[in-house]
Interface confidence: low
Amino acid sequence: FYDIETLKVIDEEWQRTQCSPRETCVEVASELGKSTNTFFKPPCVNVFRCGGCCNEESLICMNTSTSYISKQLFEISVPLTSVPELVPVKVANHTGCKCLPTAPRHPYS
Amino acid sequence: FYDIETLKVIDEEWQRTQCSPRETCVEVASELGKSTNTFFKPPCVNVFRCGGCCNEESLICMNTSTSYISKQLFEISVPLTSVPELVPVKVANHTGCKCLPTAPRHPYS
C-alpha cells in the first residue's frame, strides 16, 4: 500500500533527526560565564551537544556522558591592555545522549 | 611566537562556526502551527536553518533567502479515524544567511 522506497527514505530521515550528539556552535564567553571585560577570539567553537527529537513530548534529549575538550583561543581584555594571548579553554562535549523525562513542573505533583 | 599551525587550526574552526545554513532538526507540528489533534510521524525533519556566530554582539545570524522543500510524512488524526496517510509537507529551508543588526530594543531611540 505504501511504497517501500518512500518508507525507507522517511525512516532514514527519522533516524537522522533522533536525539544524538551533534556538532554545535557554542559561544565561549557564555559557556564559561566570563566577566564582560574578557572576550575570546574566535568567540565560538564547535563542539558536540545533544540535540534532536524524542518520540514523546514528555521526553527531552539530554546528555548522559560528557568529556571536556581543550580549544586554543585568544583571550582578550577590554580595554586592550596586553597582546591577545593564546589560552587553552576547556569546553563540554556531549558524548552520549538519551531521551529522558522532563522534570515535573510542580515538584509536589 | 604564535605557532602558525595553531593559528591555522583556530582560523579553520572559526570559519566553521560562522553564520551559515546548517542542518537542523525541526518539529513539524510546531513549524506548521497545526492543531493539537493532528500530529506527524516522524515528528521531526531535517532542514537547513541559519545558525552560527557573528563577529559582533549587535548582529544576529538571519536568513536572507529561503526555499520550501517537500517532505513525505504520515499525518495522523486523534482519535484515529482513518489509516495514517502519507502527505507532502512543505518546510522552510534556509539557503542564504547573513549577520544582520538586531532590531533596536527601543523603536524611538
Partner: antibody, heavy 117, light 112 residues
Framework: QVTLKESGPALVKPTQTLTLTCTFS??????????VGWIRQPPGKALEWLAN???????YYNPVLRSRLTISKDTSKNQVVLTMTNMDPVDTATYYC?????????WGEGTLVTVSS | DIVMTQTPLSLPVTPGEPASISCRSS???????????LHWYLQKPGQSPQLLIY???NRFSGVPDRFSGSGSGTDFTLKISRVEAEDVGVYFC?????????FGGGTKVEIK
C-alpha cells in the same frame, strides 16, 4: 621565517607628514591573532611604542601621539603603513616595524628618519 | 603611563664576572589574567633589539642560560651569571601589561 622591512624617507622637513611602510613576510595579517606595530628610538634614547594594527583592523595608538598618527594595512600586499603628521626635529629617530606578539620577537632592521629644515 | 626606571644607566663589567640590572615600574605589572608582562631585550650596537627574557623569567629560545630574570609586582632584575664579550650592548626592560606599552631607559653594558 618572519621578516619585516621598513621603508620611507630618510629626511623630512618640520611640519611635513612622514609616511612609513612596513613590508613583511612569513605571516599574514589575515591570520588570527596577528598584529603589526611601530616603535621608535631617538638616537641614544629609549624605545617608544607608537601604534599597532590587528588582524581584524582594530587599531591602537600611543595616547600621547594619537592625534598625529594613522596606521593602516593592506593585507593582500603584506604591508602596514604609518603616517605621522606635523613632524618636528624631536621626532628624529630610528623607526622599527614589529610583529606584535607578546612580547615583541620579530623586529625590522629599522629606518632612521631625520627631521630637519 | 607606566614609567619603567632602570638602574644603573651604565654597567662596566669584567668578562667572567656576574652582572645585574634592575628595573622598577611605577605600577604593578600583574595583569587582570594573572600574568606579569615584563620582558627584557638586548640591543647590540647597530642592531634591532632582540628578546632575551619574557614574562619575568622565561628565557626565549636560543638565549644562553647565563641570562636569568626574576621579580614580581613592580621590582624586576636581569642577571648575567658570567658576562661574555658578546653580551655588550644596551639592555631594556619593557612592560606590555598596560597600554601604552613602555620601555625602560636602557642600561649600557660595556667591557672594562
Amino acid at each position: 621565517q618572519v621578516t619585516l622591512k621598513e621603508s620611507g624617507p630618510a629626511l623630512v622637513k618640520p611640519t611635513q607628514t612622514l609616511t612609513l611602510t612596513c613590508t613583511f613576510s612569513g605571516f599574514s595579517l589575515s591570520d588570527y591573532g596577528m598584529g603589526v606595530g611601530w616603535i621608535r628610538q631617538p638616537p641614544g634614547k629609549a624605545l617608544e611604542w607608537l601604534a599597532n594594527i590587528w588582524w581584524e583592523d582594530d587599531k591602537y595608538y600611543n595616547p600621547v601621539l594619537r592625534s598625529r598618527l594613522t596606521i593602516s594595512k593592506d593585507t593582500s600586499k603584506n604591508q602596514v603603513v604609518l603616517t605621522m603628521t606635523n613632524m618636528d626635529p624631536v621626532d628624529t629617530a630610528t623607526y622599527y616595524c614589529v610583529q606584535v606578539t607578546n612580547p615583541f620577537v620579530f623586529w625590522g632592521e629599522g629606518t632612521l628618519v631625520t627631521v630637519s629644515s | 603611563d607606566i614609567v619603567m626606571t632602570q638602574t644603573p644607566l651604565s654597567l662596566p663589567v669584567t668578562p667572567g664576572e656576574p652582572a645585574s640590572i634592575s628595573c622598577r615600574s611605577s605600577q604593578s605589572l600583574v595583569h587582570i589574567n594573572g600574568n606579569t608582562y615584563l620582558h627584557w631585550y638586548l640591543q647590540k650596537p647597530g642592531q634591532s633589539p632582540q628578546l632575551l627574557i619574557y614574562k619575568v623569567s622565561n628565557r626565549f629560545s636560543g638565549v644562553p642560560d647565563r641570562f636569568s630574570g626574576s621579580g614580581s609586582g613592580t621590582d624586576f632584575t636581569l642577571k648575567i651569571s658570567r658576562v661574555e664579550a658578546e653580551d655588550v650592548g644596551v639592555y631594556f626592560c619593557s612592560q606590555s601589561t598596560h597600554v601604552p606599552w613602555t620601555f625602560g631607559g636602557g642600561t649600557k653594558v660595556e667591557i672594562k
